[in-house]
Structure formats: structure tokens, C-alpha cells
Interface confidence: medium
């Protein structure tokens, strides 16, 4: 874990002069109102900044926009508003940036009332040029790119039409009417729900789920009595109304909706909801809301088919009203997730899992922190993390937890140390081992970002007063240096760095404010001269992830395998560089019973790793059905945890039981499916 700050803080020499030479100010002369920023492509250095200003007139609001472009990571900007004919761009649609490095951008313009359709501006050369296109409809949503082909766009119209373009927005065709929700699936497939009797709201629970695999030439109805649907990993989920009452259930398909299985999850009533918290090609985390306005529910984790679910975490905080949950995927270490639970006493506590939801535990108390007033025992308490819920409650939390896949093991978050989350002003904590151990990194709330794959962490104090100081660390948050980036303080509005944490540039956005003038300003700081040399082999050290007991042969085994990483030494001040690739060495572990989950009809008694047959199937277990057809369930009671790669060791093969429990999903019996062509 990261040791606390000590006397031997490695200071970066002459950093003020080095950073001053690499600090670029840009004042946006005619700028106010709101500003939005988008990166176009990866490693291109192209940033688009769209500013909008609403002019209040007596009867209506008239808006104006400016569009700026940088191609050097924000050091310089050029006003390119003339490329969009000085048109007002609708910020609620944002800037639709194409997938991967397609260089495509779509801006949706405001058009005067009474026009036949909307207007878009399209670029396919990283915003060097734009083409104006008048639409045959008024868009309701932002243009959605097909993940497989950035020339294919879809959009919903204000009249609930589903429109598709095959030539990057040049020509549009309405492929279906009465559409509520549409999403791209894999292989340029479109899934969408339709209503029959008037509106999406009126028909909720009676919608039909459709699929087109050829951009609207032909269609297939793949679901009826639909409430909503969602895609996660390779799974297609639909919540379907029950025949007999107002409850609904989750059905899952892994073949794009051709066949469905009822998920072994509780049904929910009108006031409840399901939510896919996270999904990959192996499994899914599903939240099922409790009855009543409790603000919590239960997390279930699926098997590899998305059908059998294990209860993962009770009393999981997920507010019904605002739809806030603290569920966070820690992307810097495999299998790690953090979330909050609502205790019996209504306090909120943070829980962490290191094995993809198998077991949850409290976060270890940071060595360099004392327990706060929420702690009954001043020597025993935990770290509690502030995330979306705290932000929604307007606590002094400027940022959600941060982790990056290429900054292995690093997690940064606001938190408090006690028995539960505190409403007091939080501090910033860091973990360098994926959440096993934590250290207080900065006093008070801050904005923070990771640069150069973890080689630099940058932070700015969250303050209502103007600021002119940035903090940075080259040793994963142990030691901090401060740099005054401007003489005249600015009202800070945000930190911007290129997604992916590979960049060495950070942009500080804000505005200068005097009684008569308000101007946006950005300062872009390039840290390349701080990290003077490229990292070499000697700068890296071997680190075993998930290591808790080095004496144990199985130490580091999570989901059947362990991984050793090459990690940058904290004392090394060097550039990982833009082309840095995480180096890891996996090794397979022997299987134990913990590598298996209990299959349908089986459960694990308290403190036992064996799966035992349920004496009788009750409630939703009884209704559970496989593949949407009547069939006998045969199982040996165990199923390998999704993504688990263990080999050898314990092999829980035993007599295959025929549970002889008939269960039916008449949601989609084959006779209910039909096809049609345009």
C-alpha cells in the first residue's frame, strides 16, 4: 500500500520554470453562458468547445453559440463559428462525437418555429469542415452512432418516429413510427419499443419490442407486454408485465431476442424498478428495488447465461426519487466494485467487493486518519466513500471516485472515516492497491485527475473563492507540489484532460469575474518537462494484485487466476508515455468451491461453501424458467462463476439431479413471434 508522507518526499527540481514555459492561457473574448467541451478522437489533440448564451427577450429566449477548435490539446483555440454559419447549437443534444477515431462530429442546431425539420452540421474530418444538412424531422434525441459503423446513425423524432441514416446524416429514412426507445445492438442491429394506443406513457407495460438487423428493411417482433429494455455486455434484457397482475419480471436473451429465458429474479410492482448496474460478456450485476419507498434494494449477480442469480448485497442504496446509486466499477483492478448500503439506522455505509460481488466488506480504515464523530469505537471504524448520492445531496463533494484501467491499482475518492458517511467536509483518499488499503491524500474537497497512466496526479482545491494554484504529485499522491498557474485568480469550473489518462496535458477551465465583465478562460498545462525522461525497465517493479497473504500459495487468486503487473516505482519520475501498455502476467489457480456458484434450486447455508438442494422451490424460484420453453431442469447444483478461469483442484461433480420443476415463460412462445418486411 502507499506509505504516508514522510521526510523523503521526492521534490521535482525547477518545476516552476518548467511548468511556466508550458502553461498556455486562452481567453475567450466574447464568451459567457454555458460551455461544453468534447475530445474528438484519441490522441489527436483535437478539442471542440461549444459555448452558448441565452439572450432573454420579452417573449422568448434567443440564443447564440460559438464553436472553438484546438488541435494541440487545448493550448490554442481557433474560433470556427463561421463553419456552422453562426447558427445557435442546441446544448441539450451536446456534441455527438463518433466512435473510435472516426473523426465524425454532429451538432444539432436550433431552428425557427414552423420549419419542416431540424438542422444538423456534420463533420467527418475532426471538425476541420462542416456540412449543413436540413432534416426531414425534428430530433428528440442526440444522433446515435452505430458502434460498428460510424456512417450509420439513428435518431428519434419529436413525433416518435425512428429515423435512420446510412450515409452519416446526409439522407434520412423513417423506418418506424410510434417508437419509444431505440438502441444499437451488435452487428448494426437496432432494438426498439413501440406503442399501439396513443403514447409511450399510456402503453408502458404494453409496448412491443422490435428488432431490425438490416437498418429497417425487415423487422421482427421479439417481445410483447414490454415495460422497458436494456443491453449489457452480450445480454439483452426486457422487463415484461406478468399476465395475471401488475408486476413485471426480467427476461433475458443472449441471441439478440430470438429466444428468451425468465431470469431467476424477484418480480417487481408498479413503484419498483430493475437496474443493470454493470455488465460484461461474462455476467451482470442487477439491482432489484425493494417494495415501498425504501431507497434501497438488493444486488444480484448472474451466471454466465444471465439466468440464475445469486444474492450479492442486501440494502443496496438506490434512491427511487432521483435514481442515485453509488455503485462504482473500480476499473483499475479486476473484480473490484464499490457501493453504499443503507443501514437499519438509516446511516449510509460503503462496501467493497474484490471478487465481482461474491463477498462484500467495509473499506479498511486509512492508517493516517482518525475515526470521526460517527464512530462508536474511536479505534475501530472504516473509510466511507462519497459518490453520486452525496453529490446529489449537495454535500461538499465536487467529484465521484476516479480510477483508470491503465493506472493499475489507483483509486481516488472523497471520503470520511467513521461508522458511516459523514455530512462533514470530506477529505480525499487514495488507494494504490485497488481498494484494499487507503491513505488520506489531500485535506478537504478537491477536483482530481490522473495523467500519464498514473505517473502524475493533479488536483485543484474545491473553493467558492477564485483560485490560481494547482497541485501535482509524481508519486501516487504521497507528496504534493503546488504551482501558481496565473497571477489573477479565476472562478474555477472544471478540469479537463483527454479521456484515457494517457495525456500529460491538463486544462483548467474557469471564468474571470469583475462587476462588469465575465469571460471564460482556459489554462492548459503540459507536464512533459516535469517527467523529463522516458521510463525504463528499472523504473518498474513487480506487483501481485489482490495479494493479502504472501505466505498462501493461493494468494492473489481472484476468479480462478492471479495477475502480476509491472508497476511504476513511486520514486521514479519519468514518462510512461502515450503508448504505454499495462504489462501483466496471469497465472491460473486451482479450483475451490468458491469458484462455483449455486445453480438453480440450490443454496449455500451460512458459513458453508457447499451448495445444498433447496427443500422446496418458492416464490420467484418456482416461476423461474429456462430458455422460455417448458423443460426439465437438470443440474449438479454448481456452476462456474462467470469469468472464472480456475483449473484442477476441487471439481464438484456429483449426481445430476432432475429437479422436475416445470416452469413456463409464455412471454414469447414461438407462435407469438412474427416477422414483417417493409
Amino acid at each position: 500500500s502507499a506509505p504516508g508522507e514522510d521526510e523523503e518526499c521526492g521534490r521535482v527540481r525547477d518545476f516552476v520554470a518548467k511548468l511556466a514555459n508550458n502553461t498556455h492561457q486562452h481567453v475567450f473574448d466574447d464568451l459567457a453562458g454555458s460551455v461544453s467541451l468534447s475530445w474528438v478522437g484519441d490522441s489527436t489533440g483535437v478539442i471542440l468547445v461549444l459555448t452558448t448564451f441565452h439572450v432573454p427577450l420579452v417573449i422568448m429566449t434567443f440564443g447564440q453559440s460559438k464553436l472553438y477548435r484546438s488541435e494541440d490539446y487545448g493550448k490554442n483555440f481557433k474560433d470556427i463559428t463561421d463553419l456552422i454559419n453562426n447558427t445557435f447549437i442546441r446544448t441539450e443534444f451536446g456534441m455527438a462525437i463518433g466512435p473510435e477515431n472516426s473523426g465524425k462530429v454532429v451538432l444539432t442546431a436550433e431552428v425557427s418555429g414552423g420549419s419542416r425539420g431540424g438542422r444538423i452540421f456534420r463533420s467527418s474530418d475532426f471538425a476541420k469542415n462542416f456540412v449543413q444538412t436540413d432534416l426531414p424531422f425534428h430530433p428528440l434525441t442526440q444522433m446515435m452512432y452505430s458502434p460498428q459503423n460510424s456512417d450509420y446513425l439513428l435518431a428519434l423524432s419529436t413525433e416518435n418516429g425512428l429515423w435512420v441514416s446510412k450515409n452519416f446524416g446526409g439522407k434520412w429514412e423513417e423506418i418506424h413510427k410510434a417508437v419509444c426507445l431505440a438502441k444499437w445492438g451488435s452487428d448494426n442491429t437496432i432494438f426498439f419499443t413501440t406503442y399501439a394506443n396513443g403514447s409511450c406513457k399510456a402503453d408502458l407495460g404494453a409496448l412491443e419490442l422490435w428488432r431490425t438487423s438490416d437498418l429497417g428493411k425487415s423487422f421482427k417482433t421479439i417481445g410483447v407486454k414490454i415495460y422497458s429494455f436494456g443491453l449489457g455486455g452480450r445480454f439483452l434484457f426486457a422487463s415484461v408485465m406478468a399476465d395475471k397482475d401488475t408486476t413485471r419480471r426480467i427476461h433475458v436473451s443472449t441471441d439478440q431476442g430470438d429466444t428468451w429465458s425468465m431470469a431467476q429474479l424477484p418480480s417487481v410492482g408498479q413503484e419498483q424498478f430493475y437496474s443493470i448496474l454493470a455488465a460484461n460478456d461474462d455476467m451482470v450485476f442487477m439491482h432489484v428495488d425493494e417494495p415501498g419507498d425504501t431507497g434501497f434494494g438488493t444486488i444480484f449477480t448472474s451466471d454466465d447465461r444471465g439466468i440464475v442469480y445469486s444474492k450479492s448485497l442486501d440494502r443496496h442504496l438506490y434512491t427511487t426519487t432521483g435514481g442515485e446509486t453509488d455503485f462504482t466499477n473500480v476499473t483499475s483492478l479486476r473484480g473490484v466494485y464499490i457501493t453504499s448500503v443503507l443501514s437499519e439506522d438509516n446511516s449510509i455505509q460503503t462496501m467493497i467487493t474484490f471478487d465481482q460481488g461474491g463477498r462484500w466488506t467495509h473499506l479498511r480504515k486509512p492508517e493516517n486518519s482518525e475515526c470521526d464523530a460517527t464512530a462508536k469505537n474511536k479505534n475501530e471504524c472504516s473509510l466511507h466513500i462519497h459518490a453520486s448520492y452525496s453529490i446529489s445531496q449537495k454535500l461538499n463533494v465536487p467529484m465521484a471516485p476516479l480510477s483508470e484501467p491503465n493506472a493499475v491499482g489507483i483509486v481516488i475518492a472523497h471520503g470520511s472515516v467513521g461508522d458511516a458517511i459523514s455530512v462533514m467536509v470530506p477529505d480525499v483518499y487514495i488507494s494504490d492497491d485497488g481498494g484494499y488499503s487507503w491513505t488520506k491524500m489531500l485535506e478537504g474537497p478537491h477536483y482530481y485527475t490522473i495523467l500519464d497512466s498514473g505517473g502524475i496526479i493533479v488536483a485543484i482545491e474545491h473553493s467558492s473563492r477564485p483560485i490560481n494554484v494547482i497541485k501535482f504529485s509524481t508519486d501516487e499522491g504521497q507528496c504534493w507540489q503546488t504551482y501558481t498557474f496565473t497571477r489573477d485568480p479565476i472562478y474555477f469550473t472544471g478540469l479537463a484532460s483527454e479521456p484515457g489518462a494517457r495525456s500529460m496535458n491538463i486544462s483548467i477551465w474557469g471564468f474571470t469575474e469583475s462587476f462588469l465583465t465575465s469571460q471564460w478562460v482556459s489554462y492548459t498545462i503540459d507536464f512533459k518537462d516535469i517527467l523529463e525522461r522516458n521510463c525504463e525497465e528499472k523504473d518498474y517493479t513487480i506487483w501481485l494484485a489482490h495479494s493479502t497473504d504472501p505466505e498462501d500459495y493461493e494468494d492473489g487468486c481472484i476468479l480462478g487466476y492471479k495477475e502480476q503487473f509491472l508497476r511504476l516505482r513511486k520514486s521514479s519520475v519519468c514518462q510512461n508515455g502515450r503508448d504505454y501498455v499495462v504489462t501483466k502476467q496471469p497465472s491460473i489457480c486451482l479450483c475451490s468451491l468458491e469458484d462455483f456458484l449455486c445453480d438453480f434450486g440450490y443454496y449455500r447455508p451460512e458459513n458453508d461453501s457447499k451448495c445444498v438442494e433447496q427443500p422446496e422451490l418458492k416464490g420467484h424460484d418456482l416461476e423461474f424458467c429456462l430458455y422460455g420453453r417448458e423443460e426439465h431442469l437438470t443440474t449438479n447444483g454448481y456452476r462456474k462463476i462467470p469469468g472464472d478461469k480456475c483449473q484442477g483442484g476441487v471439481n464438484p461433480v456429483r449426481e445430476v439431479k432432475d429437479l422436475k420443476k416445470k416452469c413456463t415463460s409464455n412471454f414469447l412462445s414461438p407462435e407469438k413471434q412474427n416477422s414483417k418486411s417493409n
Epitope: G33, F53, V55, K66, L516
Partner: antibody, heavy 124, light 106 residues
């Protein structure tokens, strides 16, 4: 249509303080500045200072520095001007006005909406 | 602070006359100048902002010009309703008003 409604006339003794309020209705309060301008009998207009309600950012004319305090309450869309250590020369009509600012492409720079004025008389 | 000098302080004119009022700033204020009209017992009314932009609802006989340090308010054809006091106001840094020009009936 935005309106600024000021508090009623005041009669004050020399050395005391006066606090005049200015309530905005019918439009956005926060995006503009509010200026305070006074006019002594038979004299011209004199700017005292102003505030940006969005951040409570106040600015004062040199002449009134230390003697005037301008505040704003966003929740009630009300601005206040307090003048202390009153003397007979402070007898005047005090106006609040919505002040356009150099923000954005709409350089709305004048004081386009005015309150009805509050007469403050300082007399022993 | 920037000083604003308005001239003349009083101006006698008749209905239909073309009237010009000038305002001089002690240093350059770019175009950050506004003109107001005030009648006795009433609050001032904005006529021109940003030196030459006409406030909505103001008759087109009013116009403003100038930049830097020299500014002019022109009433192309004086109407009975135009007899009032006119003030210029700069807005570059702290705000200051000119001393006023009273337009009275000749």
C-alpha cells in the same frame, strides 16, 4: 417583464445608517448585475456600486468605499444597499437598476430596468 | 476613475430641431457607453447602449455614435416628449455618469 420594486422613503438622523431594498420580479435575477445610483436634489446621477447576485460579488465606487455595503439574496431575488455614517449631503433619491454586463455575444451594456426610487432624507 | 464630460450642460431647442449632445471620456472606453433620458421625478430611461445600439422600444430618431473618447447622442427631429435631461454613462471599469444635458424649449 422584469420589474424592480424598492422599499419606501426613509427619514434618518445624521450618523445613522439606512438600508434600502430592491426586489426583482418577472425575470432572471441572477444573470445580471444590480447597480445602485443616487441623485441629490437638482443634481446629476451618481453611481455608488453594484453586485452580481450569482456570486455575491460586490463592487463600490471609490467615493463610497467603506461606507456602503451592497448585498443580494438570490432566494428572494432581492438586492440591498446599506449606507452608514449618514450626513445631510446623503439626502437623495436612491435607485437600483438592472445592469447588463460584458458577457457573451449580447453586449447589453446599459441599465435597462430601474426601480421607482427611494427618497432618503437625512436631517437632525 | 474615468471622468465623463458632457456638453452643453443646457440646450434650448424647438420641436423638429436636430439636436446633438457630446460626451468626452478622460481615457478610451472603447464602445462601453450608454445614454439615458430622465424626466423630473422619474427614474432614468435607457436609450442607447454600447455607444450606438438602440434600446428596444426607443424611437429611431435617437441615435448614438463614437468610440474611444468622443461620443455623440443625436435626436434627428426633436419631439415634445423629448424635453428632458440626458446623461451619458461609461462602463469600462467602474461606472461613471456625465454631468447631464438639460434640453429645454426655446
Amino acid at each position: 417583464q422584469v420589474q424592480l420594486v424598492q422599499s419606501g422613503a426613509e427619514v434618518k438622523k445624521p450618523g445613522s445608517s439606512v438600508k434600502v431594498s430592491c426586489k426583482a420580479s418577472g425575470g432572471t435575477f441572477r444573470n445580471y448585475a444590480i447597480s445602485w445610483v443616487r441623485q441629490a436634489p437638482g443634481q446629476g446621477l451618481e453611481w455608488m456600486g453594484g453586485i452580481i447576485p450569482i456570486g455575491g460579488w460586490a463592487n463600490y465606487a471609490q467615493k463610497f468605499q467603506g461606507r456602503v455595503t451592497i448585498t443580494a439574496d438570490e432566494s428572494t431575488s432581492t438586492a440591498y444597499m446599506e449606507l452608514s455614517s449618514l450626513r445631510s449631503e446623503d439626502t437623495a433619491v436612491y435607485y437600483c437598476a438592472r445592469q447588463g454586463r460584458k458577457t457573451g455575444y449580447y453586449y447589453y451594456y446599459g441599465m435597462d430596468v430601474w426601480g421607482q426610487g427611494t427618497t432618503v432624507t437625512v436631517s437632525s | 476613475d474615468i471622468q465623463m464630460t458632457q456638453s452643453p450642460s443646457t440646450l434650448s431647442a424647438s420641436v423638429g430641431d436636430r439636436v446633438t449632445i457630446t460626451c468626452r471620456a478622460s481615457q478610451s472606453i472603447s464602445s462601453w457607453l450608454a445614454w439615458y433620458q430622465q424626466k423630473p421625478g422619474k427614474a432614468p430611461k435607457l436609450l442607447i447602449y454600447k455607444a450606438s445600439s438602440l434600446e428596444s422600444g426607443v424611437p429611431s430618431r435617437f441615435s448614438g455614435s463614437g468610440s474611444g473618447t468622443e461620443f455623440t447622442l443625436t435626436i434627428s427631429s426633436l419631439q415634445p416628449d423629448d424635453f428632458a435631461t440626458y446623461y451619458c454613462q461609461q462602463a469600462d471599469g467602474h461606472i461613471t455618469f456625465g454631468g447631464g444635458t438639460k434640453v429645454e424649449i426655446k
